[in-house]
Interface confidence: medium
């Protein structure tokens, strides 16, 4: 059998809430996988399984069940939303995210999927893990990858 | 350049109040949460609470709640603490400071420090 | 809330020697902040994120560890490096600093 390639592309978009009284933040983020199928027959999409982290703290998980199948040399764009909780013994994050004279509140979330496909019976996992800046302040829409964490954080002045 | 001017050292009697303030230069009070800290003479530092500037948002350490009360002026760009009902254990040295988040937050600038003697 | 217990509490170096300043934490943290205070003023951010330098902080200086357990290393004591350290936590409420280390130069 020939690979499966999963991609994981980035944030697709981030929507935030706020419980005012508890001074946790809600944040539902859609991600993006592209998954490529380079054999010569279909193979099943059983499942994805995603957890976000902050600050070394899972905060966020879901699982997709019986997602799709790919075709021979096929490849399809998933779409996966997890729901996450910033709750208020998260260093404060309410106060930095409810910041108002700042424009953006980019905090670093590591992304981690595993997606799990058969073909004859056979199952195999593919795991991948991102850091993504994600705008805790507002709802965001990224441009594929634009939500890429690249190693570098500079404080606002 | 970014700075924090603390009022200057304060002599109060056992019982009074006394209000601190923090002034904030080279950059935006709003953007940026303010905190304080006690020392004590001798002594290690003590986390009192933190303010939203923006929004007036506090959050106290649960031993200071009653006894300090953060404040703001955004016009002023002016932070504040009021000490209430003020005995001995009051005395000490009380520092504002910015704190900032890169990963994780941290105070990046300290105010110069208040000394408040409480004395009959 | 989380303690963090530093060690030694006072400590003399000569010039030259390693130094390392311990902070041990109740509870996991995900990373720990060092402030270096001279009497009379006010604390410096000496290292953040466990391990990054503060701007203007000596290359000789450097902090490790992870979950409960952390340090701060001098590779070659100076004797500006006199002064107290304090290791703190944003992890939880309410943030809490270490007791202090007061490094002394022989």
């Known amino acids: 059998p020939r690979s499966i390639d999963v991609k994981y592309i980035g944030v697709k978009s981030a929507y935030v809430s706020y419980d005012v009284q508890k001074r946790t933040i809600y944040l539902n983020i859609t991600n993006t996988l592209n998954i490529t199928n380079n054999n010569y027959y279909s193979v099943e999409v059983e499942n994805i399984t995603a957890q976000v982290q902050f600050a070394k703290t899972v905060i966020g998980k879901a699982r997709l069940n019986n997602i799709t199948h790919i075709g021979p040399l096929d490849m399809k764009q998933i779409d996966y939303t997890v729901p996450t909780v910033i709750a208020e013994e998260m260093s404060y994050m309410y106060d930095f995210c409810t910041l108002i004279s700042i424009k953006v509140h980019n905090i670093v979330l590591m992304m981690q999927v595993t997606v799990t496909t058969t073909y004859f019976g056979h199952s195999e996992q593919i795991s991948q893990e991102r850091y993504q800046y994600v705008d805790c302040g507002r709802n965001t829409t990224y441009q594929l990858g634009q939500s890429e964490y690249l190693n570098v954080l500079q404080p606002q002045q | 350049q970014v700075q924090l001017q603390q009022s200057g050292a304060e002599l109060v009697r056992p019982g009074t109040s006394v209000k601190v303030s923090c002034k904030a230069s080279g950059y935006a009070l709003t953007n940026y949460l303010i905190e304080w800290v006690k020392q004590r003479p001798g002594q290690g530092l003590e986390w009192i609470g933190v303010i939203n500037p923006g929004s007036g948002s506090t959050k106290y350490n649960e031993k200071f709640k009653g006894k300090a009360t953060l404040t703001a002026d955004k016009s002023s760009s002016t932070a504040y603490m009021q000490l209430s009902s003020l005995t001995s254990e009051d005395s000490a040295v009380y520092f504002c400071?910015?704190?900032?988040?890169?990963?994780?937050?941290?105070?990046?600038?300290w105010g110069t420090g208040t000394t408040v003697t409480v004395s009959s | 809330q989380i303690v963090l217990t530093q060690s030694p509490a006072i400590m003399s170096a000569s010039p030259g020697e390693k130094v390392t300043i311990s902070c041990s934490a109740s509870s996991s943290i995900s990373y720990m902040y060092w402030y270096q205070q001279k009497p009379g003023s006010s604390p410096k951010p000496w290292i953040y994120?466990?391990?990054t330098l503060a701007s203007g902080v000596p290359a000789r200086f450097s902090g490790s560890g992870s979950g409960t357990s952390y340090s701060l290393t001098i590779s070659s004591m100076e004797a500006e490096d006199a002064a107290t350290y304090y290791c703190q936590q944003y992890h939880s409420y309410p943030r809490t600093f270490g007791g202090g280390t007061k490094l002394e130069i022989k």
């Open positions: 400071a910015r704190i900032i988040y890169d990963h994780d937050w941290y105070f990046d600038v």
């Open positions: 994120r466990t391990s």
